[in-house]
């Protein structure tokens, strides 16, 4: 992923007992929040592995890169980063691994320059549909976000609400059409069983999409047609059995796409014939020579590119009178 990185060489660290300023008060120019390290030269603040339970109120106005990783934030309320004056320069915000289980509507409001957000490795049981759009209007003001990293945000099974986790995430991505400018979206390691059909059509600027290490079985109802700018599509380590003609044609039609398909349990029967033919001709798939069959048993570990139509048969379906129990 592309989490914010820092070129800072010298950080000033505040004393642990420094009292936090009230968010309504502008922080002193050189103030650094308690339990954080600050580098004005690098415009970077790091509050890392400090078990913070809330976002510091006295963040310096100069901050461009903010690391709040490895904390215990639990909830991001509306306006969690709203300050007077606003954090107008904040461009990269990393909240990964901070035990967030709830991100409320408008949590990232008043961050006009926020281009990169990483919420990975948080068990997000409750992600508001308006977490990124900030309002429940049918069309919101465009979000400045360009990169959104949401790897491994699936909560444990017993903490999930009575709704589809995929649906909850997609609702947040689509609300108010605020994320039309998004160019990188990472959704790896989230146990996704399916991809709701609307999601990609409304993210037309995507250049990089990572859906690796999920449990996707099929892409039959997913349309890639509008993703003219898509350059990388990571589908490694899913549960894909075959890609059908419609999907193959759409991927082939994207001018810059490179698709990664390693470690899927490909089923090498008669339904695989079109995909094998396509694989032999396409330059779209990276490492296509590594793709192997998982089923049926007799085909296990066979290389897809080495198969021909005679290899790809389906067991005949016997009429009921001839079937054995």
């Amino acid at each position: 992923s592309s989490s914010p990185t820092s070129s800072a060489s010298s950080f000033s660290s505040s004393a642990p007992f420094l009292a936090s300023a009230v968010s309504a008060q502008p922080p002193l120019p050189d103030q650094c929040p308690a339990l954080c390290e600050c580098s004005e030269a690098a415009r970077t603040v790091k509050c890392v592995n400090r078990n913070l339970t809330e976002v510091p109120t006295d963040l310096p106005a100069y901050v461009r890169n903010l690391f709040l990783t490895g904390n215990q934030l639990a909830v991001l309320p509306a306006g969690a980063f709203a300050r007077r004056p606003p954090l107008a320069e904040l461009a990269a915000l990393n909240l990964s691994g901070s035990r967030l289980d709830e991100v409320r509507a408008g949590a990232f409001e008043h961050l006009p320059s926020l281009r990169q957000l990483d919420l990975s490795h948080n068990p997000l049981a409750d992600l508001s549909p308006f977490a990124f759009s900030g309002s429940n209007a049918s069309v919101s003001a465009p979000s400045p976000l360009v990169e959104l990293i949401l790897n491994h945000i699936v909560p444990p099974e017993d903490e999930r609400q009575n709704r589809s986790f995929e649906g909850m995430v997609v609702a947040a991505l689509l609300a108010g059409r605020a994320l039309q400018g998004l160019r990188r979206l990472e959704l790896a390691s989230n146990h996704f069983l399916y991809l709701p059909r609307d999601v990609l059509a409304q993210l037309p600027s995507l250049r990089h999409l990572d859906l690796s290490n999920n449990s996707l079985v099929s892409l039959t109802y997913v349309s890639f047609r509008n993703l003219t700018h898509l350059e990388s599509l990571h589908l490694e380590d899913n549960a894909l059995k075959v890609l059908h003609n419609g999907t193959l044609a759409e991927l082939q039609g994207l001018p810059h796409i490179r698709v990664f398909l390693d470690n899927n349990p490909w089923v090498c029967d008669c339904h695989m014939a079109d995909m094998v033919t396509w694989l032999k001709e396409t330059e779209v798939v990276q490492g296509k020579d590594r793709l192997t069959c998982a089923y049926p048993e007799k085909m296990r570990n066979r290389v897809l590119l080495e198969l021909n139509s005679a290899d790809l048969d389906c067991d005949p379906i016997l009429p009921p009178s001839l079937q054995t129990s």
């Epitope: 592309s2 281009r115 360009v146 990169e147 250049r207 990089h208 350059e231 990388s232 001018p255 490179r258």
Partner: antibody, heavy 116, light 113 residues
Framework: SVEESGGGLVQPGGSLRLSCAAS????????MSWVRQAPGKGLEWIGI???????YYASWAKGRFTISRDNSKNTLYLQMNSLRAEDTAVYYC????????????WGQGTLVTVSS | DIVMTQSPDSLAVSLGERATINCQSS????????LSWYQQKPGQPPKLLIY???TLASGVPDRFSGSGSGTDFTLTISSLQAEDVAVYYC?????????????FGGGTKLEIK
């Protein structure tokens, strides 16, 4: 980093192939571009090759200039044909950011002189 | 063809004073903000200063800032330093159904008054 080579003196009507060797990153993972600068003049975009090999050119460069890439050698090429005196310039190769459409890494350039 | 017009062609500013360079494109850049600024010193390749219209590249001093959207953009140096003497170029990125196109402005030579 990227480093251009292959420049030199060539006669009008001649051809030349410039190379750009990349190190520290995989060329196939990035869009790469060629930009030139005539002596004492401004920058002029020539064309670009996308990660999967699609190419786009400035209208004046179409037909005479061709961008290609050899992933196994991690090298970018610019083939220039039917060269004219006005093609005399420093030729730069530049890497395009993976998210933004901006040139974030430049070589030092190689000088091409077209003269009889 | 797309034309990018920079103004002025040259500019002389006193040390510590503000310098402003404008860039106008004949068409809107991609997503209204795919506009970059570069600094070039004699004998060197261009150096990226600002991308996405207003985002400062890594290691670039805070006195540089960019603004604008669509077709009109501005580069500002809030307090000119001696090391800022250089030629500055804007560059736009464009997309149409037929593909990608990039264009540079003609450059602005910045000197000390």
């Amino acid at each position: 980093s990227v480093e251009e080579s292959g420049g030199g003196l060539v006669q009008p009507g001649g051809s030349l192939r410039l190379s750009c060797a990349a190190s520290g990153f995989s060329l196939s993972s990035y869009w790469m571009s060629w930009v030139r600068q005539a002596p004492g003049k401004g920058l002029e975009w020539i064309g670009i090759i996308a990660g999967r090999g699609s190419t786009y050119y400035a209208s004046w460069a179409k037909g005479r200039f061709t961008i290609s890439r050899d992933n196994s050698k991690n090298t970018l090429y610019l083939q220039m044909n039917s060269l004219r005196a006005e093609d005399t310039a420093v030729y730069y190769c530049a890497r395009v950011s993976s998210i933004y459409y901006t040139f974030n890494l430049w070589g030092q350039g190689t000088l091409v002189t077209v003269s009889s | 063809d797309i034309v990018m017009t920079q103004s002025p062609d040259s500019l002389a500013v006193s040390l510590g004073e503000r310098a402003t360079i404008n860039c106008q494109s004949s068409q809107s850049v991609y997503s209204n903000n795919e506009l970059s600024w570069y600094q070039q010193k004699p004998g060197q390749p261009p150096k990226l200063l600002i991308y996405y219209a207003s985002t400062l590249a890594s290691g670039v001093p805070d006195r540089f800032s960019g603004s604008g959207s669509g077709t009109d953009f501005t580069l500002t140096i809030s307090s000119l330093q001696a090391e800022d003497v250089a030629v500055y170029y804007c560059q736009g990125s464009y997309y149409s159904g037929s593909g990608w196109y990039y264009a540079f402005g003609g450059g602005t030579k910045l000197e000390i008054k």
